[in-house]
Every structure is written in C-alpha cells, then in structure tokens.
C-alpha cells in the first residue's frame, strides 16, 4: 500500500524548490525498479516529483489566499514490467498559512455624520477590516482595533471597530475630524501586520446658538419723500449655526410712532427696515426704534440657548426734501355773477412752502384768457362773463416757489358763473301759421311755446300777450295756457286771400325774473284757399306749393 503523511507547504516560500514530502509504496524495498509519477492540476508546474525516490517538491511560491489546497494523484510503476505497483491514489497538499496579509478596510472611504454636542458613548460608525489570512490558523486573522488619531474626542472598541464619542464637540469650533483607525492582526502580538483607515467625521449642526446683533446701534436715513413700503436700510444679526438653525426672524420691539416695520429677507437673513407711514421732516426729523431677532426654528430641548433675544437700537434720521408748495385746500370753488365788469374779484387761493425756509410763492393760471391771478393768489376776471356762453370754468392754478422754480404744485379751481336775468324769453322755434278763408271765429291757429336762455332760479314762468296795436285791431287773439305755452285763435269769421293774404302778429312774452324782461316775437299767418271741407292739410299743401312758387288750381 501507499505510505505517506499529510502534506503541507508553507505559503510564500522563496526557495526555488521546497521539499513537501515523500510518496512511497511499502513494496519499494530497494531491490526493484520503481518509478513514481505525479498527476493532476499543478503536477509538473507547481509540484515536481523525483520519480526515483517519490520525493515531492514545490517549485513555485504558493499563496494560500489564492489557493489553499491542491488535489493530486500518485502512481507507482515497475519500470521493468511497466505495470502499476499500487492503484492510482489521490492525495492532498495543503498550503499552510503564514501571516502575510495585513488587515484591509474594504469599505473605504468612511464618512460619518454625528450631531454636535452628542453625549459620550454616542455611536458614530463601525469600521471593519478584513484579513485574507486563515482565521483558523492561530491569530493570523484575529484583529484588534486602535485609535491612532482622534483623541480625546473619539474612542474605538478594540474588538468590534465601533467608534464612539468620548468627549462633547462643538461644531462652531471645529466642524469635522479625521480619525485614523489601525487594525492589527495577531491580536496585536509581536510580528503583527497592520492596516489603517481614515474616517471623516462631520458634525451636524444643532441649534445651540441664538442670533446676535454685532452692532448695538444702527444709523439709517429716510427721505421725507419716500413712499410707504420703502426699504430704508438693513440690519444684520449673526448666528454661528448653519442652515435651518441659522434662519432668523427680525421684529420691532419698540416703536412708539408705529412709523416703521421690519421684514426678514430669508435668503440673506437680513432685517429690512420698512417705512410703514410717511414721515415729515418739518414734523419730526428723527426716530429711535428697537429691533430684536430670534431663530425661526427652535426645538423645545434647546430653548435654554435662546432665553433672551438679542436687540439693537436703530436711529433713523429724516432727510429734508425741498417739497413743492402746499395749497391750503385740495381744490377751490368760486362763484361770480355774469356780466360783472372786467377786473372783478373771483376768489383767493393760498399755497405755502412746507419747508423751513418758507420760500415766497408765485401763482399762475394755465391757459386762461378770462381770469388772472396775482402774487397774493387773488383771482380776477379779465373779461365780462356770460353764463349763457359758459356756466363753469375749470382752471388749473400753479404755485411755484420763488427760490426754486422747479418746485411746483397745481390744483384745480372751479369757477361757477352765476345767472342774472339778462335774456328775455322768445319763441322756442320759428312759427309759420295758416288760416283758411272760410275759418270761423275762435278757431285754433297755432300753439306757441317760449324759451329763456337764463337759468331758472326756481322755474321759468312766461306771460304771453298780443302787442297793444294787435290787441286793438287784431283779427286774432291769444290765450295764455299758464304752462309756458299759449294758443293763437281767430278773432273773426272769414278771411280774404286777395285782400289780406298775410298777417304779422306781434306777441309779447315776459319772464318772471326780477326785473322782468319782455320780448316781441312776430308770428306770420298765411291766408289759404281751402276746400269745402275746410281741411287744413289741403290748405297747408297749397300754401306749401305757393311758397315754392307754384300756382294751384
């Protein structure tokens, strides 16, 4: 049978030939010609055999971490007969481990984030090294972890590689730490190999700082001409925290005048001082307000860091602006009777310089030929006014500072021209009437109405009469309807076209004004040749024809 012991080859042997062991048949007694053969993966390349003796040699450096065992086959033949002396047999050559691999951190790079101010013992991260050596071969792959850099803030558990906090850290002093961990095999004994890794530990922010004004006093200015909503300046507090923990809100703590407001620009974390009400240099030329700032988000457990909000004082100086003249009223309404003579007094406007220097004021009227204004603001007429032409005048009065002609203000002035009874009533239209030759007495010839260009104080009332001449010898009479109309009636029977073809009647119309005005209005009445039915249509038609130069049958 075969005689051999278990075969071992230490890995990483530098010799070109390392004696592994010996294959032997117990029939090999020295008196026979035996030849030993080696077969299988690695035979002839990694392992050779002295076929005379059965001695096996490793002729290559072996790496257990690449291959830990070789399965080979052994043969022995008698070279004199060529026959196998023993059945072919399989055997194993094991590559024995040496500590030739250092621990390696395969999951590099390591990075961890831990909140600042975390208490001692807080777990940060676990680092794990791998050792390619045989874990069952002594302590070649038994690791111990230690901290090379990172004291006194961190510690590492020797057997697990768990990194913990050993001292509180303030992100505002240092926001990241490089920790170097060493892993040693052979549980740290002499001859151990080591590997290191770096761990970047970043401190995440907690809101342990309140915002603080760096300036205890801000000086701002605002022009008195600034409209409400104007940003007049910014104030800024600083918060050593970052991100959401540095977001802040500004507010006004004191402002008796309630003239200002503060809004927060959440992008820049600045406080913007806003004008809430317009200011007037002449009324108050400086203000003092107090602003405060606090964080937008504060966790309940961190309230101890935010007990008293930081404040600052803001002095606001109002800048004087040369303001335009200011009229006493936003507009003026004056009244003047029509027909008053040129140079008549209309009214007085008044504007003053609101500034301290009190510049004298010059007045002017924009585009008016009817009115004039002097340096005292007195408006007079340049012409007699006729209400019936214009009852109202819309003037634009301009006030200009004498010392700065660019400072101008304008206001509307409305002048109402008051009525006087300067117009008599008159026919509301032109009247041309017709009467048939065969007309009877009392026949209505025409209804007339009147108009008066004057303004009625209460309500116009007109009085209609025939002139004295027409009253005495008239063929017609008038009846006043008492409603500002009157009717003309025939005062006889029968008219003769040939003898008197046309009548001109003078009608007096009086108004109820004081004094009353009367006008004389002529009514023309044509005598017509009417048909038997006495139709005025025919009469009117015939008259129409006549008036056009045609003769009718």
């Amino acid at each position: 049978g075969w005689v051999w012991n278990q075969f071992f080859v230490p890995e990483e042997m530098n010799t070109t030939s390392h004696h592994v062991g010996r294959l032997r048949s117990d029939l090999d007694n020295g008196n026979n010609s035996f030849q030993y053969k080696l077969l299988g993966a690695g035979a002839g390349s990694t392992f050779i055999i002295d076929e005379r003796t059965g001695d096996i040699y490793a002729i290559e450096k072996l790496d257990r971490e690449e291959r830990s065992l070789y399965i080979l086959r052994a043969q022995v033949i008698d070279i004199t007969t060529g026959r196998a002396v023993e059945p072919e047999s399989e055997f194993v050559i094991k590559v024995s481990d040496i500590n030739d691999n250092e621990p390696k951190f395969l999951d590099e790079p390591y990075e961890a984030i831990v909140p600042e101010m975390s208490p001692e013992g807080t777990l940060v991260i676990q680092v794990t090294a791998s050792d390619a050596d045989d874990p069952s071969s002594g302590n070649n792959a038994r690791l111990l972890y230690s901290l090379l850099q990172g004291q006194p803030y961190f510690s590492v558990e020797p057997t697990t590689g768990v990194i913990r906090i050993s001292s509180k850290m303030d992100r505002e002093l240092q926001d990241e730490y490089w920790v170097i961990i060493q892993a040693k095999d052979m549980i740290g004994q002499p001859g151990a190999l080591s590997g290191t890794t770096s761990v970047l530990i970043k401190l995440s922010d907690v809101n342990d700082n309140k915002p603080i004004f760096k300036e205890s006093l801000y000086r701002l200015t605002v022009s008195e001409s600034a409209p409400t909503g104007t940003s007049i300046g910014t104030i800024m507090a600083y918060d050593n925290d970052i991100g959401e923990n540095a977001e802040m809100d500004y507010s006004i703590e004191e402002d008796d005048s309630q003239t200002f407001d503060i809004i927060t620009n959440h992008e820049t974390q600045e406080g913007i001082v806003i004008l809430k009400k317009k200011v007037n240099f002449e009324h108050q030329n400086h203000y003092g307000i107090r602003a405060k700032v606090k964080n937008h988000h504060v966790d309940e457990q961190l309230m101890k860091y935010h007990t008293e909000a930081s404040t600052t004082f803001i002095k606001i100086q109002v800048e004087d602006v040369d303001e335009p003249p200011l009229f006493l009223l936003p507009y003026y309404i004056f009244e003047i009777f029509e027909e008053t003579p040129q140079g008549s007094f209309v009214g007085v406007v008044s504007a003053t310089d609101p500034d301290n220097r009190k510049s004298p004021i010059r007045y002017s009227i924009t585009r008016s030929k009817v009115f004039n204004i002097d340096d005292n603001g007195t408006i007079t007429t340049t012409n007699s006014l006729d209400r019936e032409i214009s009852a109202w005048y819309n003037l634009s009065i301009t006030a200009t500072e004498k010392y700065n002609i660019e400072q101008i203000s304008s206001i509307p002035v409305y002048v109402q021209v008051l009525n006087i009874n300067d117009h008599a009533p008159e026919f509301s239209q032109y009247y041309e009437s017709y009467v048939c030759e065969n007309a009877g007495s009392g026949q209505v010839i025409q209804t007339i109405s009147a108009v008066d260009r004057d303004e009625s104080i209460e309500e116009h009332h007109f009085y209609f009469n025939l002139s004295v001449e027409d009253t005495n010898s008239s063929s017609f009479t008038i009846i006043d309807n008492q409603d500002n109309t009157a009717v003309i009636l025939t005062n006889r029977t029968g008219f003769n076209l040939q003898e008197e073809p046309i009548f001109y009647i003078s009608i007096l119309i009086a108004d109820n004004g004081i004094p009353s005005l009367t006008s004389t209005n002529t009514l023309t009445i044509h005598v017509c040749d009417c048909d038997d039915s006495g139709s005025t249509q025919t009469c009117q038609y015939q008259e129409l024809m006549l008036s056009m130069g045609f003769k009718t049958e």
Epitope: S33, T53, I79, T80
Partner: antibody, heavy 120, light 108 residues
C-alpha cells in the same frame, strides 16, 4: 561494456550557458531501467549531483541548481546533454556523466569527466 | 536534504592494514540506497558498494560495507597499494542524491 564520453567547450564566459553532451556506447539509452545523470566536482572538492533524465524525457534536478539546469536526451544519437545557464566562476568544475541503475540507485558507469572553466 | 558526514577526513595506513571508513547521515537512510565510491587522482569515481553492503561487479572481496539507519561503514580488510585513494559515500534514499565530503586514504 557500457562507456560514456563527455564533450563540450572547456572554457565558458561568465553569464553564458555551459553546454555538454554525453555520448553512450555499448548500450542503448532507450533500453530502459537506467537513468542518466550529470555530476560535477569543483577543483579539490567533493562531488555534487546535478540531475538525471530518463529515456522518456522525464527529469529531476538538484533543487539548488534547478533554476539554471536543463537536461535533454536524444535517443537517436544515444546522447544526453546538460545545459547550465548564467554561469559564474563558481561553476568551474570537472563535469561527469554517469549511468544510474534503477534498482540500486547507484552510479555504476561514469565518463572520464571534462574540465569546464568559467572565465572571461 | 540529507547531509552525509565522513570520518576521518584523512586516514593514514600502511599496506596490509585494515581500513575502517565511517559515514554518518543527518537523518535515517534506507540501507538499500547507500553506496560507496573510490576516486583516484585524475579519474572518475568508481562504484564499490551499493545497497550498503553489496559489492559492485569486479570489486575485490577485501571491500565490504555495513551499517543501517544513520551509521554506515566501509571496511578494507587488508590494504593493497592500489587502494590508496579518496572514498565517497552517497545516499539516494531521498532526493536530492548527496555525497559525503570524502575520506582520503593515504600511505603511512
């Protein structure tokens, strides 16, 4: 009667390859049962076994020289050869070829030897 | 490898005397694979004994070998003038084949 005869240059330059041939007469290398060996003897020193070859071509070399030695066989010429590469002065020696009995593992026939000097 | 140590390094004897040469192995060697050689100046070595005790062809019977394990002996019972030479022991029980450093037998 088996006879062995070494032949080859007596002088080799350092770093070059030493080449020797052993011609066998009086018996066939191919007959089997024998291994054919090379041995050397440094001047005034003992013997050092270099390696062997079987007619089939299987070889085995002294581990101390393995990386530099090649032994080959030419059965048609009834010869076997030695090549030793990268020689230095330490390789200066008398080189013997010999027959190795497969049963006794003893070197029963030897050539007379040839001195090879390594020198530039 | 097995180291063979021969003693004495030089043995001075007169013809007719008995010579005893020793060969000690660094580890046990099968007696089947120990041989003795004789080398005269300018000549190749000649096989005397194989298998620790078997004489090679043509070797006179005054040469004999013995021993086992780690201690082996070559004995020349009565020295002849042609026996004065250098003697080497050799093992091939395990690889590589190794030789002793030699014992020089010289005429006294």
């Amino acid at each position: 009667q088996v006879q062995l005869q070494e032949s080859g240059p007596g002088l080799v330059k350092p770093s070059q390859t030493l080449s020797l041939t052993c011609t066998v007469s009086g018996g066939s290398i191919s007959s089997g049962g024998y291994y054919w060996s090379w041995i050397r003897q440094h001047p005034g020193k003992g013997l050092e076994w270099i390696g062997y070859i079987y007619y089939s071509g299987s070889t085995f070399y002294n581990p101390s020289l393995r990386s530099r030695v090649t032994i080959s066989v030419d059965t048609s010429k009834n010869q076997f050869s030695l090549k030793l590469s990268s020689v230095t002065a330490a390789d200066t020696a008398v080189y013997y070829c010999a027959r190795d009995s497969s049963s006794s593992r003893a070197l029963d026939y030897w050539g007379q030897g040839t001195l090879v000097t390594v020198s530039s | 490898e097995i180291v063979l140590t021969q003693s004495p390094g030089t043995l001075s004897l007169s013809p007719g005397e008995r010579a005893t040469l020793s060969c000690r192995a660094s580890q046990s060697v099968s007696s089947s694979y120990l041989a003795w050689y004789q080398q005269k100046p300018g000549q190749a070595p000649r096989l005397l004994i194989y298998g620790a005790s078997s004489r090679a062809t043509g070797i006179p019977d005054r040469f004999s070998g013995s021993g086992s394990g780690t201690d082996f002996t070559l004995t020349i019972s009565r020295l002849e003038p042609e026996d004065f030479a250098v003697y080497y022991c050799q093992q091939y029980d395990s690889s590589p084949r190794t030789f002793g450093q030699g014992t020089k037998l010289e005429i006294k």
